[in-house]
């Protein structure tokens, strides 16, 4: 707490400029009006002012606005910002998606920190859902915000959101995220043609059931490796060989370098070894030519 | 050891064909798709397409499209690939070259397509 | 089509040298579940065929010597020759195949001073 003390002759502030970075705090919180300082927020980031001192203008708007402060002020704090808690933060209604930028500006570069994550969250929650032009934003300035969010929080972005994701968005999404996804892209894509639509939903197939892995192999598609290996392992096993190569295309010959990995190697062991020599890349494992195959699974659930 | 044997040169005449030849040898023919690159003069690589010699499954780089066929022969460990419609354009070094990784390659046919 | 772009295009450095050289991709060829870079560098002697060095941007083949270190992820990727050897005199090639057409960089001529 700064202590109260009366402005010195001549030193009250009339307006906030260069001057005030040679007061000292207990000047600066005795001469500087509030309310000059609520009205005049934008000028503060043009001014060196010491992290002491903008210990003291925060202070000021603290007492001017114990409720939470107006958007018109929140839209110019600037490197103010970087002094606000997640508490302050709480106490706020954002509602401009410019206020949001202008913030998230402040924090570029660096990671997501817990003053950012509540501004967000208010934010998104202020607007009831997350909207193309918010998550063309929040992507723009955290690539990896998509997956840093529930499974519940992802199931209110609408599907006309999903044209502003980037495949990078999706990069670290776990299979659970991108199930919530996946229907949401299936939907936003829906009216595009085949080879358009594929590189589209590409990035949110993690998601994908077998039956749809089964209609893109169907048409032509050629599906990377590094996308293959990221399907899920419970759609990718009832996949045939003649399914998966044509899913793969070309890119089959890398079945080869990957059989070790999941969901290649699981795949291997439930496919014929007749059908998997038909690929001409020498993989073993499969099921000796002979042998019957029993679906268990099937078999419990009958019994 | 692996072998991947092309004859040295091939010259033939504009608007001609010409099949070029690749006989492996030392593995399993069938484990290993075959692919096939062109090599201009002083230029880089490119390549033309792979075929599976397991089944004759074949993919082509769309530039090669309307210029490459790429078969195989199991039965003498060979695969082909014919050009057809021939420009001075096509006047390469044309490599074949084993598996994903290109591990082994042919010697190589240098064609020269002159009048 | 995925670019590969090589630098330098031609380097002379004198036998025991260490030389470097570099391979970019216009996008990333990480396969991010096995952690392969799918991405090798193939060298290619005057009046030979092209012959693999090094696979999966690090692995090197068999019978390479260890001279030859191959480092790097995503897009961009690096060649290494510690200690020149004349017979090293060759152009040095890196080929994506993380993606059909599978490419090529205009590759780097190494001369020996």
């Known amino acids: 707490e700064v202590e109260k003390t009366a402005c010195p002759s001549g030193k009250k502030a009339p307006e906030i400029d260069e001057s005030l970075i040679f007061y000292k705090k207990w000047e600066l919180e005795a001469c500087v009006d509030a309310a000059l300082l609520a009205t005049q927020m934008d000028r503060v980031n043009a001014i060196p002012f010491t992290y002491e001192q903008l210990d003291v203008l925060k202070h000021k708007l603290d007492e001017l606005y114990p409720q939470g402060y107006p958007e018109s002020v929140i839209q110019h704090l600037g490197y103010l910002f970087l002094k606000m808690s997640p508490e302050d933060i709480r106490k706020w209604n954002v509602t401009s998606l410019e206020t949001l930028k202008a913030l998230l500006e402040v924090n570029k570069g660096h990671e997501m920190s817990p003053q950012v994550a509540t501004l967000i969250d208010r934010f998104v929650k202020g607007r009831g859902q997350l909207d193309k032009d918010t998550l063309d934003t929040l992507t723009a300035f955290y690539p990896g915000y998509l997956c840093s969010l529930s499974p519940e929080e992802l199931s209110s972005v609408p599907p006309s959101s999903i044209w502003a994701v980037r495949p990078q968005d999706l990069d670290t999404c776990d299979p659970r995220q991108l199930d919530v996804l996946y229907p949401k892209a299936r939907l936003a894509f829906q009216n595009m043609n085949g080879s358009e639509y594929f590189v589209k939903i590409q990035s949110f197939l993690g998601g994908a059931p077998t039956e749809d892995l089964k209609a893109l192999s169907q048409q032509n598609v050629s599906m990377d490796l590094a996308t293959f290996m990221k399907l899920r392992t419970d759609a990718v096993l009832p996949l045939t060989v003649a399914e998966v190569q044509k899913l793969l295309g070309p890119h089959v010959e890398g079945l080869k370098a990957e059989e070790r990995h999941r969901p290649v190697r699981d795949w291997i062991l439930r496919q014929r070894q007749d059908d998997l020599d038909t690929l001409g890349l020498g993989l073993q494992g499969g099921i000796p030519n002979g042998y019957l195959v029993l679906d268990l699974s099937m078999q419990e659930a009958l019994s | 050891q692996v072998q991947l044997q092309q004859p040295g040169t091939e010259l033939v005449t504009p608007g001609a064909s010409v099949k070029l030849s690749c006989k492996a040898s030392?593995?399993?023919?069938?484990?290993?798709?075959m692919h096939w690159v062109k090599q201009r003069p002083g230029q880089g690589l490119e390549w033309i397409g792979n075929?599976?010699?397991?089944?004759?499954?074949?993919f082509y780089n769309e530039k090669f499209k309307n210029k490459a066929t790429l078969t195989v022969d199991k039965s003498s460990s060979t695969a082909y690939m014919q050009l057809s419609s021939l420009t001075s354009e096509d006047s390469a070094v044309y490599y074949c070259?084993?598996?994903?990784?290109?591990?082994?390659w042919g010697q190589g046919t240098t064609l020269t397509v002159s009048s | 089509d995925i670019v590969m772009t090589q630098s330098p295009s031609s380097l002379a450095v004198s036998v025991g040298q260490k030389v470097t050289m570099s391979c970019k991709s216009s996008?990333?060829?990480?396969?991010?579940?096995?952690?392969?870079?799918?991405l090798a560098w193939y060298q290619q002697k005057p009046g030979q065929s092209p012959k693999l060095l090094v696979y999966?941007?690090?692995t090197k083949d068999s019978g390479v010597p260890d001279r030859f270190i191959g480092s790097g992820s995503g897009t961009d990727f690096t060649l290494t020759i510690n200690s020149v050897q004349a017979e090293d005199l060759a152009d040095y090639f890196c080929?994506?195949?993380?993606?059909?057409?599978?490419?090529f960089g205009g590759g780097t001529k190494l001369e020996i001073k």
């Open positions: 070259a084993r598996g994903w990784l290109r591990d082994y």
């Open positions: 030392g593995y399993s023919f069938t484990s290993y798709w």
């Open positions: 075929i599976n010699p397991s089944n004759g499954d074949t």
């Open positions: 996008q990333s060829l990480l396969n991010s579940s096995s952690q392969k870079n799918y």
């Open positions: 999966f941007a690090s």
């Open positions: 080929q994506q195949h993380y993606t059909t057409p599978y490419t």
